[in-house]
């Protein structure tokens, strides 16, 4: 018969390393007689025999953790007691080893330039993972502004435009590496004007381009203000490159103005705005420029449709609120006056009035009306319409022809340019060219009137040379 023997632990517990979800086993080999009772504790708390997470075999000498969790980390002790002598105990640690895991990954961040940005990256793992960051394709270097915190988060002080980009954090230990998803750091930059428009002093009718360049993130929009109101005319060209917007406002200058470039961008619910202004002043506001202000365009009306050269440009005088309508009304009123004139005079007078009210136009930098050639005017006045002209002049002097539009809009022939001085400076009347053989058969004008320098009327040519401005009144 065996002699009683107090328990002796022959294989003391050792530190066990185990990966999460793997099996971990502690061996507590005991020699004793009679057979001992063996109990197990974790961090001094008894492990119950019926706890399904554990398996206790070999009379209690073998403790197996069936699927290790990170919370199983701790000190495991086995205690053997058989009533002979005292109980014996051996302890060992379970170190739960864990591949790196990112528990709080970074998220997309929008931040205004100059503020502080923090991209989180909280990790788990055993051994404790080291955390580094990648920007784009390369490892991010820490500096006085950029630091990886103890927690793994990335802190960027005084965020700059160049900090914008794609970031990911990397958690690494001896068991492996974990990568976060790529996140975007967007640096929003308040709108700022890089190049302000320059002031100009130009001649009337010049084209001026005002240029305004702004930067921001998001790219700003640029709007233009003229004397406090949105610019209503002029063409705007915009070009965007690398967060910089370049806006060019082309203007046809007919009046001085204060032009303001406004660059705006949005940050969440708030807007940032930058402004810069320039003045456009007009040098040499000459009388003729003031009086001849207008534009060239095709005639769309009805009254002079059959008289004016098809497709030619005519001058519209912007001293009228609606030049097209005002001039059409003038000519309509004038034609009503012509109903009573002779069949010989009427077509010539219509040609004269239409070409006087809708003068051929040279659409240069300053749109310029081309007055009727003096010789053609005199031909109508002293040949085709001699009687009517005399009668009309008499009535006019007595105030009989006065109407809401002053006088019947006939030109003063003597003030018109002569085709002999500069054939390109005035307009011929095609009707008279067509009738030139009739003109030469007219009886002589009485000596009291100036003799007409009847032109050897040349073939009509449309010339668009710039001529001196000519007032239509």
């Amino acid at each position: 018969e065996k002699l009683p023997k107090a328990p002796v632990i022959t294989t003391p517990l050792e530190t066990v390393d185990a990966l999460v979800e793997e099996v971990a086993t502690f061996m507590c080999a005991v020699e004793s007689y009679p057979q001992p009772e063996i109990s197990w504790t974790r961090n001094k708390i008894l492990i119950k025999l019926f706890d399904t997470r554990y398996s206790i075999r070999e009379n209690g000498q073998l403790l197996t953790i069936l699927s290790v969790e990170d919370s199983d980390d701790g000190i495991y002790c086995c205690t053997a007691n058989n009533g002979v002598g005292g109980a014996v105990e051996s302890c060992g640690a379970l170190q739960v080893k864990m591949k790196p895991k990112i528990t709080r990954p970074p998220i997309n961040v929008k931040i205004i330039e100059g503020l502080k940005a923090v991209l989180p990256c909280t990790t788990m793992g055993n051994p404790k993972p080291s955390v580094s960051w990648i920007k784009g394709d390369s490892a991010l270097r820490e500096n006085s502004r950029i630091a990886v915190l103890e927690s793994g988060s990335l802190r960027i002080h005084n965020v700059q435009k160049e900090d914008a980009g794609q970031y990911r954090c990397v958690a690494k230990n001896s068991l492996g590496t974990a990568y976060s998803k790529l996140v975007k750091l967007e640096v929003e930059v308040f709108a700022r004007i890089l190049r302000a428009p320059e002031s100009h002093n130009v001649t009337f009718g010049s084209f001026v381009t005002l240029r305004c360049t702004a930067i921001g993130m998001p790219v700003p929009t640029i709007s233009w203000i003229e004397n406090g109101n949105a610019v209503s005319s002029g063409s705007i060209q915009e070009n965007v490159k690398d967060r910089v917007i370049d806006s060019r406002l082309q203007l046809f200058i007919t009046k001085p103005g204060l032009y303001t470039c406004i660059a705006t961008n949005k940050h969440g619910e708030k807007f940032s705005t930058a402004k810069a202004a320039a003045t456009v002043s007009i040098a040499e506001w000459s009388k003729s420029q003031k009086e001849s202000k207008g534009y060239c365009a095709q005639y769309r009306g009805e009254v002079c449709d059959a008289v004016l050269v098809k497709d030619s440009l005519v001058f519209f005088n912007t001293s009228y609120p609606d030049p097209e309508e005002a001039q059409e009304l003038l000519i309509h009123t004038a034609w009503n006056e012509l109903k009573a004139v002779s069949p010989l005079c009427r077509p010539a007078a219509e040609a004269l009035l239409c070409n006087h009210l809708f003068q051929e136009c040279s659409p240069g930098v300053l749109p310029t009306p081309m007055p009727i050639c003096r010789e053609y005017c005199l031909a109508v006045k002293e040949l085709f319409c001699a009687k009517e002209w005399l009668a009309m002049e008499g009535k006019t002097h007595r105030g009989l022809y006065r109407s809401g539009m002053h006088f019947l809009p006939v030109p003063e022939c003597s003030k018109l340019p002569s085709m002999h001085q500069d054939p390109t400076a005035c307009t011929r009347l095609p009707y008279l060219d067509y009738k030139k053989e009739n003109i030469t058969t007219f009886p002589s004008i009485t000596s009291s009137k100036p003799s007409v320098d009847i032109p050897n009327l040349p073939a009509s040519t449309s010339s668009f040379a710039v001529s001196p401005a000519y007032s239509m009144t």
């Epitope: 209503s232 005319s233 002029g234 534009y295 060239c296 365009a297 095709q298 769309r300 009306g301 009805e302 449709d305 098809k310 497709d311 440009l313 609606d322 097209e324 309508e325 059409e328 009304l329 309509h332």
Partner: antibody, heavy 121, light 112 residues
């Protein structure tokens, strides 16, 4: 209040005729040019015809010349479009529109709500 | 017969700027075409916006402006608003033997 009210639209067989009217109110009718513009279902705008303030001239889109006639009665403040020899491609909403001035051509600054003309057999 | 061309569709963000253009299949748009611009929302009659290149009809907000840029007429909306979502048509006066007025095919503008 300025108003343009079209009437006379409806279903007509190819080759048939219709006369559209546009009653104007709220402005001096005989001071303004007028136009007819149409819009086929799901399509864009198409200018059809124009007339100046005094009815002295008339203008038409090439494809309706000889078939359509625009006219106006300034005393009745009414614009008309007589449409003959109608074709299926004339199916559209026809709008009466007012010019901003006397002459026939130019911007249209007021429009009626339109009348539907359907040409179908 | 020249065809008047417009972008079939364009989009703009609220508060953004968008430019719609109006060209001719042959030749350039000039002031002699007197470009006009119209807005049409679904189920409504058109409404005049701009006439003779750059003049605004009364009651039209100042964010709408017209111009001729290069060889095309242009309608610029500065600071677009949701109610600007509509079809936009340009109209050109044409003279080729006879007087004519031609609309473009229209641009569907979406305000995103």
């Amino acid at each position: 209040e300025l108003q343009l009210v079209e009437s006379g639209g409806g279903l007509v067989q190819p080759g048939g005729s219709l006369r559209l009217s546009c009653a104007a109110s709220g402005f001096t009718f005989d001071d303004y040019g007028m136009s007819w513009v149409r819009q086929a279902p799901g399509k864009g705008l198409e200018w059809v015809s124009a007339i100046p303030w005094n009815g002295g001239s008339t203008y038409y889109k090439e494809s309706v010349k000889g078939r359509f006639t625009i006219s106006r009665d300034n005393a009745k403040k009414t614009l008309y479009l007589q449409m003959n020899s109608l074709k299926s491609e004339d199916t559209a909403v026809y709008y009466c529109a007012k010019r901003s001035g006397r002459i026939a051509f130019g911007a249209l600054d007021a429009w009626g709500q339109g009348t539907l003309v359907t040409v179908s057999s | 017969q020249a065809v008047v061309t417009q972008e079939p569709s364009l989009s703009v963000s609220p508060g953004g700027t968008v430019t719609l253009t109006c060209g001719l299949s042959s030749g350039s748009v000039t002031s002699s075409n007197y470009p006009d611009w119209y807005q049409q929302t679904p189920g409504q009659a058109p409404r005049g916006l701009i006439y003779s290149t750059d003049s605004r009809h009364s009651g039209v907000p100042s964010r709408f402006s017209g111009s001729i840029s290069g060889n095309k007429a242009a309608l610029t909306i500065t600071g677009a608003q949701s109610e600007d979502e509509a079809d936009y048509y340009c109209g050109l006066y044409m003279y080729s033997g006879s007087k004519n007025y031609v609309f473009g095919g229209g641009t569907k503008l979406t305000v995103l």
